[in-house]
Every structure is written in C-alpha cells, then in structure tokens.
C-alpha cells in the first residue's frame, strides 16, 4: 500500500496481559513484537482498539487457553470478538467455542477468530472470553489484531 | 490494489511437503493452487518466505495435525511462526497449542495462527512444529503465506 | 486504501443460516454484522462468493460445530474452501479437520480457514463440510469472506 | 533501564568447557528474547545463540549446535550460555543482548573474551 498521507497504512497488533481483574474482556500490552502504526488505531485502557477512521477493517484475534473437563463450567469456552460503536448497542462480531479438554491438569487449546468488518470513527472491538483465568499468556499464544483494508 | 510498478502487491501462499528430515521447520513447495506474486517475495530452501521490502505484512499458516495422546508425548502439540531478522534473534511470533486426541489410531486437528508484523529488508518468516511427522498433507490441509498490507 | 473508482475495495462477510437442504455446501446469508462492498463482488444463492475481477484475494472461513464421537461418523469433521472458476473444475484450495468430541450430547469445536488466492473473473468460491448438521449458527460462530489485496 | 552484564569468559583449552552468565538488572518481560552474539578478531560479529525468556524456544548457530546449550532463569534475572567441547575457532568476545521486539536488539553488554587455546 505505501499509502500517502491522506491514506495511510492502519494496522495494529497486541500482545496478551495477564490481569487480576475479574471482567471476562482480555487485557493487552504493546510489548513484544507488537504493531502500533499510527495514531490513527490506539489501545485504550489495555482493553480495546479503537479507530479513528471509518472504512473496511481485517479484524482478528487468536486465544489459547488450558482448561479441563472436570474443573469447568459444563458449558465450552467461548472467545468473542465485539464491537462498541458511539451511540450503539454492544455487538458480537465473531465468537468460536471449544469444548474443554479432557486431559490432566488441563489442556491447551487455540483458537482463531477474524473477518471484515465495516467500523465507525471511534469504533472500538475487544475480546471477551468465558474465564480469564485459563488464557495462555507465554510468547505468541494470545494476541489481537486489526488492519484498515 | 493494483498497484503501480512502485508499490507492486506482494503476496505468497505455499503448500506444505512432507520432509524425511528431522527438523521441527515445515517444508513448503510452489505447487498446486499456490500463489507467489513476484520477486519480491521467495521461498528459500521449501522453508521460509523471505521479503526483499520492509514494511507491515499480514503473515499466516494453518497446520493440520494427526496425533493420539497415548501415543505422543505429554506436552501438546504446538505450532510457531517464526521470524529470523538480520542481526537479530530468531523470534516467536505466534503460538497454537492442542492437546493430543484420545481418538484412535490417531485425532485430526487443525491450528490457525494470523497477524500483523513489520518486516525488515532480507526477514523470513518460517513455522516450526513439536512433531513434524505429526502433519497432515492432504490438499489444504496445511499451508502458509504472507501478504504486504 | 480508499481506492479511487479504478480500483475500488472490494469485500465480503456473510453470516452462516440454517438449511433444510441435505447438500454438504453451507448456505450464507446478508445480515447482521454483513459486509458486501459493492457489486463487484455477490453472494450468489446464498452458497457462494463470486468475484467480478481478476487479482489476489485473502480468502477466509470460520466454521463453529456440535458434534459427539459416537453419535458421528469416524471420519473427522472436515471445513473445505473451494474454487469453481469458469471452465476449470471445481478445486479444493484449504480444509480443516478436527475429531469429534467425546463430551454430550455433543461438544463444541470451531475451524478457521484462510489464505490468499488468485482469482479469476467470474471464479466462485464455497464451503464445505461433512455434516452441515452439525454447524452452530449462533451470533457469531460461522462465517465467510474476502477481500481483495 | 535495563543494564546486562556478562561474566564467565576465560582462557581455556581446547575440548574444555566454559560457561556465561548474563545477569540483568531491570525487567526482562516476558515476550523479549535473550542471546549471545560474538566477534572474533578482523571478523563480523555473528550469531551464537539465544532463548526466548518465557522458554518458548531455543535457538542455535549450526556451527555451535550440540556442543553449546543456552538457557534462563527468570527467578534471577539472567541467561546462561553453556559451551563445551569448545575449539580454537570459538575465541571471541561474546556478547549479550535483549531483543526487545518491535524495539529491536535494544540492550547490550559490555562483552567478555573466550579464548580457546593449549
């Protein structure tokens, strides 16, 4: 692309945080080998991505965990991936759901989530998942992610 | 994009090959429904994508994997993307991780990883596995690209 | 990329709907959170995504399934993306394979495909899978799309 | 800010063994890599060997690969290169570094001299 000024490249990419705070929406960091291209997509409150432009966005995010069986909830861990547009309702763009593993202590799973989405000037999507607690956090297994088409 | 002579597309998708070494690197080939859009992006020695520009790439691989718990070692299989700079360390840039199917005589599973990435001049891009004997090479069933945003 | 009229963005995501046809093709549908950017690229009865122009596509699909290991089939459950272009036969560009759960009534999986691949004018591409039965279509769980690099 | 300094190096003989310590003072994190380059006399500094400091993969030149072992203690802040079977064209001042990711390779140290000889 090597867009010009008027059309820059908008791309982001964060890094997983682990966090002691109870809500089920993820926490990332711009650490590692993270992408921040511009002021033009910023991480807010380590929680969410939010644009300043409106247009086409490649959205994704990608969470591994390590759950069990026996110590989960019946239901399947569920990772979802949802937008917070000014002045609208919350909404669920993408979910993926696995079923927890049987093995012992627990079993690590991935799974990956993304597509194109249309995004409003000061659109914000971030990742909710069923239990924090059993997101992976070592190099590479978690992360979140957008690019402006 | 369709872009001009100075800002040409760079993309490339390959298809996995089955190696008799014993290496944890992937092998890939041009072959079958495979893209590589230019010079400006080559596959070196069937196992990394090297990029002659610098600039923010969307880098992906899907690996598929066969494996029995008991019949496997106790930790899960994991897939990595890789990236070797000059200068630099080789890094992790994205992990998956499954735990090993109790199914028998061996569990299919498939692993997503995708993201964002600045790339130097002369940086490849290469996807390592626990147990490459593990993979699935079946049409489709594992592959890897890369695309310059 | 904001693209001028010569080379406008073209995109799609479609959201998954529930069948009654016994076809393995999975049906897709215009709403919710859908995204079709212009003519210049349709759902055709509501299977598949046909482009109008020629060039690289990052190509992309999210299946969420249900199923249980002795309720099913031994095969695995299988997502193929496939290509029919015009006077070419149909071809099979990725697949994703995951083994059934033993958790019930079923256990919840979800596969995400994606690559990129050059199409030709008039090319459809689909989706495929071994048992359309067991495909989620919650908010969210099963998708499909493209753009064009 | 993160200060790296590396201890270990020495004089010894062929077939014998040394092992670096690289102690950091400050925060590694989780998602950086650590490593060792080194330099021999009138040649370019080049890669040795270096570890990913969550231990999610080490990696190796060819030309030390099973004879030279790296590894991290996070307790404590520091990397370790153990060398063995160690040979005349191993002399070289050895140098630890913090690949910070996007920030690149963003910390050194100061080198120590391996010197392999009878």
């Known amino acids: 692309m090597q867009k010009g000024d008027q059309n820059p490249q908008i791309a982001a990419h964060v890094i997983s945080e682990a966090s002691s705070k109870t809500t089920s929406v993820l926490q990332w960091a711009e650490k590692g080998y993270y992408t921040m291209s511009n002021n033009l997509v910023t991480l807010e409150n380590g929680k969410q991505l939010t644009v300043k432009r409106q247009g086409l966005y490649y959205i994704y995010a990608q969470v591994t965990f390590c759950s069990n069986r026996e110590a989960s909830s019946q239901a399947p861990f569920i990772a979802s991936l949802c937008l917070k547009s000014p002045g609208r309702f919350e909404r669920i763009l993408l979910r993926a759901a696995n079923t927890h593993s049987s093995a012992k202590p627990c079993g690590q799973q991935s799974i990956h989530l993304g597509g194109v989405f249309e995004l409003q000037p000061g659109a914000s999507v971030f990742v909710n998942v069923t239990d924090p607690s059993q997101v992976s956090h070592g190099t590479g297994f978690t992360s979140f992610g957008l690019l402006k088409l | 994009m369709q872009k001009g002579d100075q800002n040409p597309q760079i993309a490339a998708h390959v298809i996995s090959e089955a190696s008799s070494k014993t290496t944890s690197v992937l092998q890939w080939a041009e072959k079958g429904y495979y893209t590589m859009s230019n010079n400006l992006v080559t596959l070196e020695n069937g196992k990394q994508l090297t990029v002659k520009r610098q600039g923010l790439y969307y880098i992906y691989a899907q690996v598929t994997f066969c494996s029995n718990r008991e019949a496997s070692s106790q930790a899960p299989f994991i897939a990595s993307l890789c990236l070797k700079s000059p200068g630099r360390f080789e890094r992790i840039l994205l992990r998956a991780a499954n735990t090993h199917s109790s199914a028998k005589p061996c569990g299919q599973q498939s692993i997503h990883l995708g993201g964002v990435f600045e790339l130097q001049p002369g940086a490849s891009v290469f996807v390592n596995v626990t147990d490459p004997s593990q993979v699935s090479h079946g049409t489709g069933f594992t592959s890897f690209g890369l695309l310059k945003l | 990329m904001q693209k001028g009229d010569q080379n406008p963005q073209i995109a799609a995501h479609v959201i998954s709907e529930a069948s009654s046809k016994t076809t393995s093709v999975l049906q897709w549908a215009e709403k919710g959170y859908y995204t079709m950017s212009n003519n210049l690229v349709t759902l055709e009865n509501g299977k598949q995504l046909t482009v109008k122009r020629q060039g690289l596509y990052y190509i992309y699909a999210q299946v969420t399934f249900c199923s249980n290991r002795e309720a099913s089939s031994q095969a695995p459950f299988i997502a193929s993306l496939c290509l029919k272009s015009p006077g070419r036969f149909e071809r099979i560009l990725l697949r994703a394979a995951n083994t059934h759960s033993s958790a019930k009534p079923c256990g919840q999986q979800s596969i995400h495909l994606g690559g990129v691949f050059e199409l030709q004018p008039g090319a459809s591409v689909f989706v495929n899978v071994t048992d359309p039965s067991q495909v989620s279509h919650g908010t969210g769980f099963t998708s499909f799309g493209l753009l064009k690099l | 800010e993160v200060q790296l300094v590396e201890s270990g190096g020495g004089l010894v003989q062929p077939g014998g063994s040394l092992r670096l310590s690289c102690a950091a003072s400050?925060?590694?994190?989780?998602?950086?890599?650590m490593g060792w380059f080194r330099q021999a006399p009138g040649k370019e500094r080049e890669f040795v060997a270096s570890i990913e400091w969550d231990g999610g993969g080490a990696y190796y030149a060819d030309s030390v690969k099973g004879r030279f072992t790296i590894s991290a203690d996070n307790s404590k802040n520091t990397a370790y290169l153990q060398m063995n079977s160690l040979k005349p064209e191993d002399t070289a001042v050895y140098y630890c570094a913090r690949d910070g990711g996007t920030y690149g390779m963003d910390v050194w140290g100061q080198g120590t001299l391996v010197t392999v000889s009878s």
């Open positions: 400050g925060n590694i994190f989780i998602n950086n890599a």
